[in-house]
């Protein structure tokens, strides 16, 4: 028969054969013969590959440097990569996670719209008319004007977006 | 057709040194491990080492590790056996193979004799 | 790293069933599925009979099996017959990343 020009899935072509790719986890060893499948191995400690592949080496799992700030978030198999992220009160620089950088805090005049994780950063907004922020902060929303009314009290003072109303008594109508 | 050649052998003395070649043709000889095994007269199989496709893995048996260093050159197709510090226990047929841990292939051997 | 035990001889009359058992250790045999089987005729290089513990090698007839159980493995011929004398060797890799074989069995057909 003819040798063959291309190979179903999961197959790589050498010497005019067909033969099966190495599962995730392993690697390449021998490539098959007209006798024998494919000969893999495992990937060693801290190492992983995580297609069906016929590579000569595994990769191996990334780094969690706590000196960038980072930890592991999942441990790496021999199919999987370790995955990184950092540590309380940082974030990812890039998708990657290679590096970490303090969380951004809110400007007084800015609230927090959503808190940061370990992969995202800190995003402040505008308060608001009717709102106020009074601190620079990474977790502190825009506080609402105090209701004057409700405490039977008037506005002396008004409210900005980085200051609250001042409330006063109201003046008494004299008899 | 896969054909391994083994060449090199021959009588040494005890403290001498050999240089063991393997010749490789027939099959794409930088993506697959090689092998050397020998055989001692009259007994049996006993592995000596391996080495990965790029040369960057090594592994020996305890008995050979320091004084043998297995190489190869993909350039030229052929798998090395360096023997030095040579001792009578190591007079043996040395068969180099094609893989890391299985044989479907093998060369037809190389005698080395160690002898005073 | 001691050599995998196996039994120094088997014997066994035309037509019977044989099995060569090779014994090794949790570092060994017991750690992976990649023990081989060699049959080694006098005079000629060993030939694979059976890879991976179980697979079979194309042409190699089916009379020839392999299997396992923790640190030993072993394998069975079936249908035995006068060409099948020669010496078999068991081959284990090892957590060392290194090979292991077993001293051989001598295989007589009576």
């Known amino acids: 028969p003819e040798p063959p020009t291309a190979c179903r899935e999961k197959q790589y072509l050498i010497n005019s054969q067909c033969c099966s790719l190495c599962q995730p986890g392993q690697k390449l060893v021998s490539d098959c013969t007209e006798f024998t499948e494919t000969e893999c191995l495992p990937c060693g400690e801290s190492e992983f590959l995580d297609t069906w592949n016929r590579e000569t080496h595994c990769h191996q799992h990334k780094y969690c440097d706590p000196n960038l700030g980072l930890r592991v978030q999942q441990k790496g198999t021999s199919e999987t990569d370790t995955i990184c992220t950092c540590e309380e009160g940082w974030h990812c620089t890039s998708e990657a996670c290679e590096s970490c950088v303090l969380h951004r805090s809110c400007s007084p005049g800015f609230g927090v719209k959503q808190i940061a994780t370990g992969v995202s950063d800190t995003i402040c907004e505008p308060c608001p008319v009717g709102f106020f922020s009074n601190v620079s902060s990474a977790f502190e929303k825009c506080h609402p004007w105090t209701s004057c009314e409700t405490k039977d009290l008037v506005v002396q003072q008004a409210g900005t977006n980085k200051t609250d109303v001042v409330c006063g008594p109201q003046d008494r109508l004299r008899a | 057709e896969v054909h391994l050649v083994e060449s090199g052998g021959g009588l040494v003395q005890p403290g001498g040194s050999l240089r063991l070649s393997c010749a490789a043709s027939?099959?794409?000889?930088?993506?697959?491990?090689m092998s050397w095994v020998r055989q001692a007269p009259g007994k049996g199989l006993e592995w000596v080492a391996n080495i990965n496709q790029d040369g960057s893995e090594k592994y020996y048996v305890d008995s050979v590790k320091g004084r043998f260093t297995i190489s190869r050159d993909n350039a030229k197709n052929s798998l090395y056996l360096q023997l030095n510090s040579l001792r009578a226990e190591d007079t043996a047929e040395y068969y180099c193979?094609?893989?890391?841990?299985?044989?479907?292939?093998w060369g037809q051997g190389t005698l080395v004799t160690v002898s005073s | 790293q001691s050599a995998l035990t196996q039994p120094a001889s088997v014997s066994g009359s035309p037509g019977q069933s044989i099995t060569i058992s090779c014994t090794g250790t949790s570092s060994d045999v017991g750690a992976y599925n990649y023990v081989s089987w060699y049959q080694q005729l006098p005079g000629k290089t060993p030939k694979l009979m059976i890879y991976?513990?179980?697979n079979r090698p194309s042409g190699v007839s089916n009379r020839f099996s392999g299997s396992k159980s923790g640190n030993t493995a072993s394998l069975t011929i079936s249908g035995l017959q006068a060409e099948d004398e020669a010496y078999y060797y068991c081959g284990s890799y090892t957590t060392s990343s290194t090979l292991i074989f077993g001293g051989g069995t001598e295989l007589t057909v009576l």
């Open positions: 193979a094609r893989g890391g841990y299985r044989y479907a292939y």
């Open positions: 027939g099959f794409t000889f930088s993506s697959n491990w």
């Open positions: 991976d513990v179980t």
